[in-house]
């Protein structure tokens, strides 16, 4: 069964800057990745970035840089300033779509006890939805 993992890290140098990393553990071909905050994609969350494997990347503030790390993982740097700045308990969600086979989504937030710049290695997060 495919799984999605999400890792959220606060940067030590800029405490309002977050890095979100997401990955897909499965054999399917990814057709689109959507990163949102405030809840799952399609369930009240706000889209921060959309990454298509061939057609490019779209992102919206406060997203600063979204990129593919591998064919099945992405990273997104958020630059926080003012009202749109993320806070420590913000939930970030990643949805990996494989059209028309299905989509898989998981969410994560900054670990409560994490120091800036320190984070546990990514582990598979529970699947919230599989269409």
């Amino acid at each position: 069964t495919p799984e999605v993992w999400v890792q959220v890290r606060m940067e030590a140098t800029e405490l309002s800057s977050f890095t979100i990393r997401c990955g897909f553990l499965g054999s399917g071909s990814i057709s689109l990745v959507t990163v949102s905050w405030g809840g799952p994609n399609g369930a009240g969350g706000t889209t921060l970035a959309v990454l298509h494997p061939e057609r490019g990347i779209r992102q919206w503030a406060p997203a600063r840089q979204a990129r593919w790390e591998t064919q099945s993982s992405i990273s997104l740097i958020l630059e926080g300033s003012g009202a749109s700045s993320p806070c420590a308990n913000t939930t970030f969600c990643c949805k990996f779509a494989s059209f028309p086979e299905g989509s898989w989504e998981a969410c994560g937030s900054l670990p409560p006890s994490s120091d800036p710049g320190l984070s546990a290695p990514p582990t598979p997060a529970p699947i919230l939805r599989a269409d």
């Epitope: 057709s31 689109l32 959507t34 399609g42 298509h52 057609r55 779509a97 059209f99 028309p100 269409d131």
Partner: nanobody
Framework: EVQLVESGGGLVQPGGSLRLSCAAS????????MGWFRQAPGKGLEGVAH???????RYVESVKGRFTISQDHAKNSLYLQMNSLRAEDTAVYYC??????????????WGQGTMVTVSS
């Protein structure tokens, strides 16, 4: 959660017409296109038509002049009127909501699909 439910597929003779419907519920922020893809038996996926957030319809060359895509915002519905159907239009048709990349509508959510068979 976004849900898309297609209807209207079926068996039709060449030259006939069908109207596909898609009932949408839920919303994903910043999606800016809605449309139809199809997958013929043993073939790859093809974007048939989509409507941008500006309301402009776009069609793949092979259906221009035969297919018409439209929306009813009050009913949260999308339609595909298919006229002068040909055998090569036989496929599973998917309603999609997605994000625009140039002239392409990248599916983020989609329905279960409805089968259209054009045969005499």
């Amino acid at each position: 959660e976004v849900q898309l439910v297609e209807s209207g597929g079926g068996l039709v003779q060449p030259g006939g017409s069908l109207r596909l419907s898609c009932a949408a519920s839920g919303y994903t922020s910043r999606t800016d296109c809605m449309g139809w893809f199809r997958q013929a038996p043993g073939k790859g996926l093809e974007g048939v038509a989509h409507i941008d957030s500006d309301g402009i319809p776009r069609y793949v060359e092979s259906v221009k002049g035969r297919f018409t895509i439209s929306q009813d915002h009050a009913k949260n519905s999308l339609y595909l009127q298919m006229n002068s159907l040909r055998a090569e239009d036989t496929a599973v048709y998917y309603c999609v909501v997605g994000f625009k990349f140039g002239d392409y509508c990248a599916p983020n959510d989609w329905g279960q699909g409805t089968m259209v068979t054009v045969s005499s």
